[in-house]
């Protein structure tokens, strides 16, 4: 505040992402994700932190399992409120297969196109949420390299729920999901004990995404 009591400068809270980013969230929608509303709660908490609009952050959502569905494109909605309503309505598509490479590749090739709302010169961010080793992991290395070549920043989230439910080792799965994340891995990879715990990483994930434009 100046001597004449005018506001000279102010610092905005670091809670909202008001920068320009094109974010595509790639959701595993296979049956083993349970309960599904933990995923929609996670989406809600993450998206409400974003300043969404054609000149701010844009968000698209892709769901995969046995195949891939574009739930909505980057340019489909022009406000946070609209995106929140749409995200809440996303239903689980189901299926037994977890085609993670296909989901990521489809997001890269289709979701991040100008036809679907991607903007030239705007940083591309992909958030991948999955709960199991991919059935197409032989393709994963190439798919990740293709994302790298296109400068797509990747955050990956491993949900350990189905492994914990079956008392299975998570080691191989965690390694796979870590390999999806951008470097440095410790800033781009998250794991949660089960689906209910997804909401606990929203703050940290949000901060790391928003930091990309800092």
């Amino acid at each position: 505040v100046s001597p004449t009591f005018q506001v000279v400068n102010s610092i905005a809270p670091v809670q909202e992402c008001s920068t320009q980013l094109d974010i595509v969230i790639v959701l595993d929608g296979s049956n083993s994700i349970y309960p599904w509303d933990s995923v929609t709660a996670f989406l809600n908490d993450l998206l409400e932190r974003m300043d969404i609009g054609p000149k701010q952050t844009q968000v698209g959502i892709v769901q995969y399992g046995e195949n891939v569905t574009h739930e909505f494109n980057l340019n489909k909605y022009s406000s946070t409120e609209e995106v929140l309503v749409a995200a809440k309505k996303i239903v689980q598509r189901g299926g037994r297969q977890t085609m993670t490479a296909l989901g990521i590749d489809t997001a890269r090739k289709e979701a991040f196109t100008e036809a679907r709302g991607a903007r030239r010169g705007v940083k591309k961010v992909m958030v991948i949420v999955t709960d199991g080793e991919s059935h197409d992991n032989h393709r994963l290395k190439k798919v990740i390299q293709d994302c790298e070549d296109e400068n797509i920043q990747r955050f990956s989230i491993a949900i350990l729920g189905s492994y914990n439910r079956g008392n299975l080792s998570t080691e191989k799965f965690v390694e796979e999901i870590k390999s999806i994340a951008s470097e440095p891995t410790e800033k781009h990879f998250f794991n949660v004990s089960d689906e209910l715990a997804l909401v606990t990483i929203v703050k940290a994930l949000g901060e790391r995404i928003f930091a990309l434009e800092a």
Epitope: S30, Y34, P35, E66, R93, G94, G95, R165, D194, L196
Partner: antibody
């Protein structure tokens, strides 16, 4: 709109065979498990077994293993429950229900979110 | 297998009253994987609650579930005429599904 439509009521004699059906619509039927539940007259609910129509993987409750056969035809989005030789004690209402959850890797979990209207089977 | 015991067997209440239904498991239900269903005469069961406390789509907020481990409760805060029915709990944490024997909520 998710719907499970079951075949009509059946009246059979002991020893006869029977197959009842459950047709799903309004969702990807091959991507969700379908369970069968029995309700004997004036009694509670009993889980019988479950099938994944996409590849016909099937699990049975120990109480019903060998007593019934669960199958599916994914081309027509239909699950079936059948008996080769009915008994009077098979008289009951039979429901199919969609599982929101999974039954892979030896671990089954989830709730039944949509139910068929039921098929009454009378054996006498 | 886990045995679920519901109490009371019958609950006689008037519309507007609060109903509290209990479901006790013979062993701990993993991850609070317990659901509640409502069944009216000549109708199929209808999902009310899953994962112990989450309301299913379209279920009024007068229905609430609570509990963990071996003790679970379904509460109907103010009974409406359409709430008089049989209520079943169901566990699904053991690669098998078992139901309680049911609690009948009848008009007093």
């Amino acid at each position: 709109e998710v719907q499970l439509v079951q075949s009509g009521a059946e009246v059979k004699k002991p020893g006869e065979s029977l197959r009842i059906s459950c047709k799903g619509s309004g969702y990807s039927v091959t991507s969700y498990w379908i369970g069968w539940v029995r309700q004997m007259p004036g009694k509670g609910l009993e889980w019988m077994g479950i099938i994944y129509p996409g590849d016909s993987d099937t699990r049975y409750s120990p109480s019903f293993q060998g007593q019934v056969t669960i199958s599916a035809d994914k081309s027509i989005s239909t699950a079936y429950l059948q008996w080769s030789s009915l008994k009077a004690s098979d008289t009951a209402m039979y429901y199919c229900a969609r599982l929101q959850g999974d039954c892979s890797g030896g671990t089954c979990y989830g709730h039944f979110d949509y139910w068929g209207q039921g098929t009454l089977v009378t054996v006498s | 297998e886990i045995v679920l015991t519901q109490s009371p067997g019958t609950l006689s209440l008037s519309p507007g009253e609060r109903a509290t239904l209990s479901c006790r498991a013979s062993q701990s239900v993993s991850s609070s994987y317990l659901a509640w269903y409502q069944q009216k005469p000549a109708q199929a069961p209808r999902l009310l609650i899953y994962v112990a406390s989450r309301r299913a789509t379209g279920i009024p907020d007068r229905f609430s579930g609570s509990g963990s481990g071996t003790d679970f409760t379904l509460t109907i805060s103010r009974l409406e005429p359409e709430d008089f029915a049989v209520y079943y709990c169901q566990q699904y944490g053991t690669s098998s599904w078992t139901f309680g024997q049911g609690t009948t909520v009848e008009i007093k």
